[in-house]
């Protein structure tokens, strides 16, 4: 949805009594107007168990839910209950279009609420709000990857979440790099996982009424050592005109720290190969992978002498890999011919 659009669920007509749970994505700053029941007999709107007041930035008024400008803390579950009964007329979850735009992921959205003019509706044990986001139970990830486990839940009162690893309370204090607990997103994030992170991660969601739990099984796969892998087709054969600039690209993948060299094949005494059978080369550039732009060889203002074979050579503690490409340099275009060429189209 564009930020300029307004989110409207439906006009304020008689509600369906078999209202399905809905999920709406709303862009930050976007106005929201949702209706529930006829205007004169509209239902009461609740957010996460608290009834919305008829005034304010987020308000429930005559069956309408109105948000002047959607903010990250407005995300959550909204219920519309029929007046004088507990019949659910609307049941929907508003989610932020880009949840990462939240200024502070760990901030509890409840802290933004003013509870003074809200009424509570019946207590409810915790339940999963997005079980489809929890369907991948078994995770097998290479060492060094980032892992994110989510257990989005709701209830009344709003439940708390805590995490266990192999049945023990888990705060990540013994983990290099620690962990990120994003309570607003009901998530646990571990960056640069290592084999010691393997195990069963349990999210335990609790409130005064009850508790639910879910287990994620994490396996960390140790990367098998191998010599550098060079992306196929790079460097690529290139044709350039005298005086132009050329870039040759070499993409290197390596778990162990790689060392990269750019070589140009040369001829000595009319021969391209030495007595040992190896080609004669000139080292043009050498560096480690973390050096800036080591994977690119820049050739400025090329001349005919720059034509030839170029090799990207990458090595690590396990072995060497290399791939080559040819640079063809064409003579500079004849300016007389270039200028005359457009005229040729207009002659018989």
């Amino acid at each position: 949805l564009e930020a300029s659009e307004e989110v409207e669920l439906e006009p304020c007509l008689a509600p369906s009594l078999e209202q399905q749970e809905q999920e709406l994505t709303v862009a930050l700053g976007q106005p929201v107007r949702l209706c529930c029941g006829r205007a004169e007999r509209g239902g009461h709107w609740y957010k996460e168990g608290s009834r919305l007041a008829p005034a304010g930035r987020v308000r429930g008024w005559r069956g309408r839910l109105e948000i002047a400008s959607f903010l990250p803390e407005d995300a959550g579950r909204y219920l519309c209950l029929a007046r004088g009964s507990m019949i659910v007329l609307q049941n929907l979850t508003l989610i932020t279009g880009d949840s990462l735009t939240s200024s502070n992921d760990d901030e509890d959205p409840k802290s933004h609420r003013d509870p003074s003019n809200r009424h509570s509706y019946p207590q409810q044990a915790p339940y999963w709000t997005h079980p489809q986001r929890m369907e991948k139970k078994l995770h097998a990830v290479p060492a060094g990857n980032t892992v994110k486990f989510r257990c989005p839940a709701a209830g009344n009162p709003t439940p708390t979440i805590r995490w266990l690893k192999d049945g023990q309370a888990f705060h990540g204090e013994n983990r290099i790099g620690g962990i990120r607990l994003r309570h607003q997103h009901w998530s646990l994030v571990m960056e640069s996982v290592v084999p010691s992170d393997r195990g069963t991660y349990t999210c335990l969601v609790e409130n005064a009424v009850g508790s639910i739990r879910y287990n994620y099984l994490l396996d960390v796969l140790e990367r098998s050592p191998h010599r550098p892998i060079l992306q196929a087709g790079l460097p690529a054969n290139t044709t350039a005109v005298v005086g132009s600039d050329v870039e040759l690209l070499c993409k290197v993948y390596s778990d162990a720290q790689p060392h990269i060299q750019w070589l140009k094949h040369i001829v000595i005494n009319g021969s391209s190969f030495g007595a040992d059978g190896f080609p004669y080369v000139q080292v043009l550039k050498t560096a480690d992978i973390n050096s800036s732009e080591v994977e690119v060889l820049y050739l400025r203002n090329v001349s005919a002498e720059d034509a030839g074979e170029y090799t990207c050579l990458a090595g690590n503690s396990i072995g060497l890999s290399y791939q080559s490409a040819w640079l063809t340099v064409l003579p500079e275009e004849d300016p007389t011919w270039t200028a005359a060429a457009p005229e040729a189209r207009y002659t018989d």
């Epitope: 139970k137 195990g199 099984l217």
Partner: antibody, heavy 118, light 112 residues
Framework: EVQLLESGGGLVQPGGSLRLSCAAS????????MSWVRQAPGKGLEWVSA????????YYADSVKGRFTISRDNSKNTLYLQMNSLRAEDTAVYYC???????????WGQGTLVTVSS | QSVLTQPPSASGTPGQRVTISCSGG????????VNWYQQLPGTAPKLLIY???QRPSGVPDRFSGSKSGTSSSLAISGLRSEDEADYYC?????????????FGGGTKLTVL
Amino acid sequence: EVQLLESGGGLVQPGGSLRLSCAASGFTFSRNYMSWVRQAPGKGLEWVSAISGSGGSTYYADSVKGRFTISRDNSKNTLYLQMNSLRAEDTAVYYCARVTSPGAFDIWGQGTLVTVSS
Amino acid sequence: QSVLTQPPSASGTPGQRVTISCSGGTSNIGTNTVNWYQQLPGTAPKLLIYRNNQRPSGVPDRFSGSKSGTSSSLAISGLRSEDEADYYCAAWDDSLNGPYVVFGGGTKLTVL
């Protein structure tokens, strides 16, 4: 072709031991969780144990905990189930199965029969 | 006794639609996805439905699965004689001493 082939079943006395093997082929064995499931004659399926791809995490049914050990040798693409202190109620066809990320058993072996009897 | 409850038997005539139910609890079906397996006589089980309602390639669209709350069901439409088999539901269980896998007791489907 993706395939699992169990072996090692046979007749064993109560209190005895047996080691089952499951040879895998046709997929990257080391990346997959694997599991053992058994079926007593004329009965339903019963989950026995599971192991992560690296072998670093293992899971067991209460009925076999402390008696059975699941393990794997990724260099040989083989899954094992070491069964100790066997009881008559352990008599069953034992299947090995590959486990998908949502937790389903998508590939099964043909099974190997273990009979515990005196 | 199985953690997941299935009717021991079901039957139908060719072309009919048959439904097999599977009932569990919050820690298994209520929290985890449900898988269904078909076991033809004398053979190993075969994955029929995974993640509540997904069919692996090669499984006919006559087979469908659904889940609601702590229950799941397998529906077979256009019943055929070759569908005569045992059907099992299964799910991971995340109760206090989990995680582990639980199966239903199985339903023997007879095609009349």
